[in-house]
């Protein structure tokens, strides 16, 4: 499917609005420090050029690849060397090395100020004054902070952002209308970014096969009535879409995602009964809806798996003839029967089955050797079941904040070398699994919890890769994608760690503590808790609880005082001394 001009092809397929949005996202994800105006200028230049190619596909440079066109444009940025350092060296390379060089310099934790939300009236004025600029700014600010955000999905978020302002800026109580919508978009956006980051990490670090295995398992759970061939076709197409987006080919990705949505809606009967309501929606909403669609009901008459995968005498013959296909069918059959299992568990089971066949098909009596293979699955299934049960009980007993604190202590003891901000961010997010999953019925708890934990732990892995400090983290992150969570769960107190020297400055607080939001106060306290554990890794739960209770009392007391700063100055050193004594 070759075109004389790739840029003209994509412009015509996507339309001007989506074309411009996607190019802005691409540029913002590559050059995360560039000012908004600079990116808008580059996007406008590319768009004007694309229009000349639409008018005449044989015009000069219209035959160049998108990466060549976009890369050449990015390499015109005057301050590249000063702003980005060695990333500027990418410009000396030729395509496709240049693009992959840019991709490798994407920063998962860019040094950008947190986005502050202006007053509602200020935002509504800005929206009405220049709607187009307002929405472009949203795309830019999100994309540069989330360099792997799924680009076509970000266009959907921008459409919802626009709809929220269009509705709420007309409302009697603008704030009551708008703020909950913005909070929801922020939270959903962060979750979407983290989920996509795991997909890209899977493709980057573990490759095509790992992603396809994940997709077979997930789509088989969603579409248990679909044939294996249908699921395989969807997996191939979905892998292409995500490979393109993760590779920076955002126009191709958006185009192929639209094609996939079209295909799914034209073939609902052979995929799932749940697609109907998605397929009536406009493109961006439709694609989002299809991605989030609930699992279809399982066919009633599914036979036991044992017949084909354990009892049959042809297991080794079928395996040897086409290993990937046979294992793919096993994964499909197991996953469609088990919407109650996490995708990661299903992949572990497939891996265990493969290992058994590798061993047994070389044995004197293969059938005898693999006859009990399903029994070997039991401990693999029970491990996440027990973990979810125990942690949900703990969450219900403690509530979210204290559950997060328990995880902070647990993870700081496991990997105390990791930076405090990373431990706080990751543990707070691990703790959110409680509110997200523990309220669900039993059959939905494990897929919710373990697959969410995989997303959160991937964040730890990408942050740690940027600044590696712990061999244990490196090992858990790199050895096996499907065993990351069990690997972290199995880590114990790091006995080799030399406790951090006590620094009074770390535990010195001021009156500004009192004006912080509840969330910011929690983060401050949790930061102190991590530092405490780094100082005293062998402190007991009771000791830490005592110190944290004293801390909360001390802050509450000083925030009620007339002279808050004087109180912090006087009570702070007392708190530090008492804490040191309690932990001695």
């Amino acid at each position: 499917d070759t075109h004389k001009s790739e840029v003209a092809h994509r412009f015509k397929d996507l339309g001007e609005e989506h074309f411009k949005g996607l190019v802005l996202v691409a540029f913002s994800q590559y050059l995360q420090q560039c000012p908004f105006e600079e990116h808008v200028k580059l996007v406008n230049e590319v768009t004007e050029f694309a229009k000349t190619c639409v008018a005449d596909e044989s015009a000069e440079n219209c035959d160049k690849s998108l990466h060549t066109l976009f890369g050449d444009k990015l390499c015109t940025v005057a301050t590249l060397r000063e702003t980005y350092g060695e990333m500027a060296d990418c410009c000396a390379k030729q395509e496709p090395e240049r693009n992959e060089c840019f991709l490798q310099h994407k920063d998962d934790n860019p040094n950008l100020p947190p986005l502050v939300r202006p007053e509602v009236d200020v935002m509504c004025t800005a929206f009405h004054d220049n709607e187009a600029t307002f929405l472009k700014k949203y795309l830019y600010e999100v994309a540069r902070r989330h360099p792997y955000f799924y680009a076509p999905e970000l266009l959907f978020f921008a459409a919802r952002y626009k709809a929220a302002f269009a509705e709420c800026c007309q409302a009697a109580d603008k704030a009551a209308c708008l703020l909950p919508k913005l909070d929801e978009l922020r939270d959903e956006g962060k979750a979407s970014s983290a989920k996509q980051r795991l997909k890209c990490a899977s493709l980057q670090k573990f490759g095509d096969r790992a992603f396809k295995a994940w997709a077979v398992a997930r789509l088989s759970q969603k579409f248990p009535k679909a044939e294996f061939a249908e699921v395989s076709k969807l997996v191939t197409d979905l892998t292409k879409v995500h490979t393109e987006c993760c590779h920076g080919d955002l126009l191709e990705c958006a185009d192929d995602r639209a094609d996939l949505a079209k295909y799914m809606c034209e073939n609902q009967d052979s995929i799932s009964s749940k697609l109907k309501e998605c397929c009536d929606k406009p493109l961006l909403e439709k694609s989002h809806c299809l991605a989030e669609v609930e699992n279809d009901e399982m066919p009633a008459d599914l036979p036991s798996l044992a017949a084909d995968y354990v009892e049959s005498k042809d297991v080794c013959k079928n395996y040897a003839e086409a290993k990937d296909v046979f294992l793919g069918m096993f994964l499909y059959e197991y996953a469609r029967r088990h919407p109650d299992y996490s995708v990661m568990l299903l992949l572990r089971l497939a891996k265990a089955y493969e290992a058994t066949l590798e061993k047994c098909c070389a044995a004197a009596d293969p059938h005898e050797c693999y006859a009990k293979v399903f029994d070997e699955f039991q401990p693999l299934v029970e491990e996440p079941q027990n973990l979810v049960k125990q942690n949900c009980e703990l969450f219900e007993q403690l509530g979210e904040y204290k559950f997060q604190n328990a995880l902070l202590v647990r993870y700081t003891k496991k990997v105390p070398q990791v930076s405090t901000p990373t431990l706080v961010e990751v543990s707070r997010n691990l703790g959110k699994v409680g509110a997200k999953c523990c309220k669900l019925p039993e059959a939905k708890r494990m897929p919710c919890a373990e697959d969410y934990l995989s997303v959160v732990l991937n964040r730890l892995c990408v942050l740690h890769e940027k600044t590696p400090v712990s061999e244990k983290v490196t090992k858990c992150c790199t050895e096996s994608l499907v065993n990351r969570r069990p690997c972290f769960s199995a880590l114990e107190l790091d006995e080799a760690y030399v406790p951090k020297a006590f620094n009074a400055e770390t535990f010195t607080f001021h009156a500004d503590m009192c004006t912080l939001s509840e969330k910011e106060k929690q983060v401050k306290k949790q930061t102190a808790l991590v530092e405490l554990v780094k100082h005293k890794p062998k402190a007991t739960k009771e000791q830490l609880k005592g110190v944290m209770d004293n801390f909360a009392a001390f802050v509450e007391k000083c925030c009620k005082a007339d002279d808050k700063e004087a109180c912090f100055a006087e009570e702070g050193p007392k708190f530090v001394a008492a804490s040191q004594a309690a932990l001695a």
Epitope: E97, Q204, G207, D208, R209
Partner: nanobody, 125 residues
Framework: EVQLVESGGGLVQPGGSLRLSCAAS????????MGWFRQAPGKEREFVSA????????YYADSVKGRFTISRDNSKNTLYLQMNSLRAEDTAVYYC??????????????????WGQGTLVTVSS
């Protein structure tokens, strides 16, 4: 373990052609991506071309696009690089490489776990 053995290098005049071969033995399977890289004296190793063993999708460096063609023969477990319209700047040691996982970044040498010993291509009159 996978072993890769290149052959077909040699001296050729500018404008001439050569066909490099890379025989793979061991446990190659359909998930592999195979690639050609080259290294000229005093320069970094650079990406030339790659192919997905599974679907036959090909990738080329801009500098060789239209002149070089990568292909594979699954039955012989052999990778080829047909090089036409050779130029002096194509002079280098050419390496065959295999990435058993088909990771996302196909131009990055670190993503290829297995390497051949290299074959020298000299383009000179």
């Amino acid at each position: 373990e996978v072993q890769l053995v290149e052959s077909g290098g040699g001296l050729v005049q500018p404008g001439g052609s050569l066909r490099l071969s890379c025989a793979a033995s061991g446990s190659t399977d359909s998930a592999y991506r195979m690639g050609w890289f080259r290294q000229a004296p005093g320069k970094e190793r650079e990406f030339v071309s790659a192919i997905n063993w599974s679907d036959g999708r090909t990738y080329y460096a801009d500098s060789v696009k239209g002149r070089f063609t990568i292909s594979r023969d699954n039955s012989k477990n052999t990778l080829y690089l047909q090089m036409n319209s050779l130029r002096a700047e194509d002079t280098a040691v050419y390496y065959c490489a295999a990435d058993p996982d088909s990771r996302l970044y196909y131009t990055v040498p670190q993503n290829y776990d297995y390497w051949g010993q290299g074959t020298l291509v000299t383009v000179s009159s």
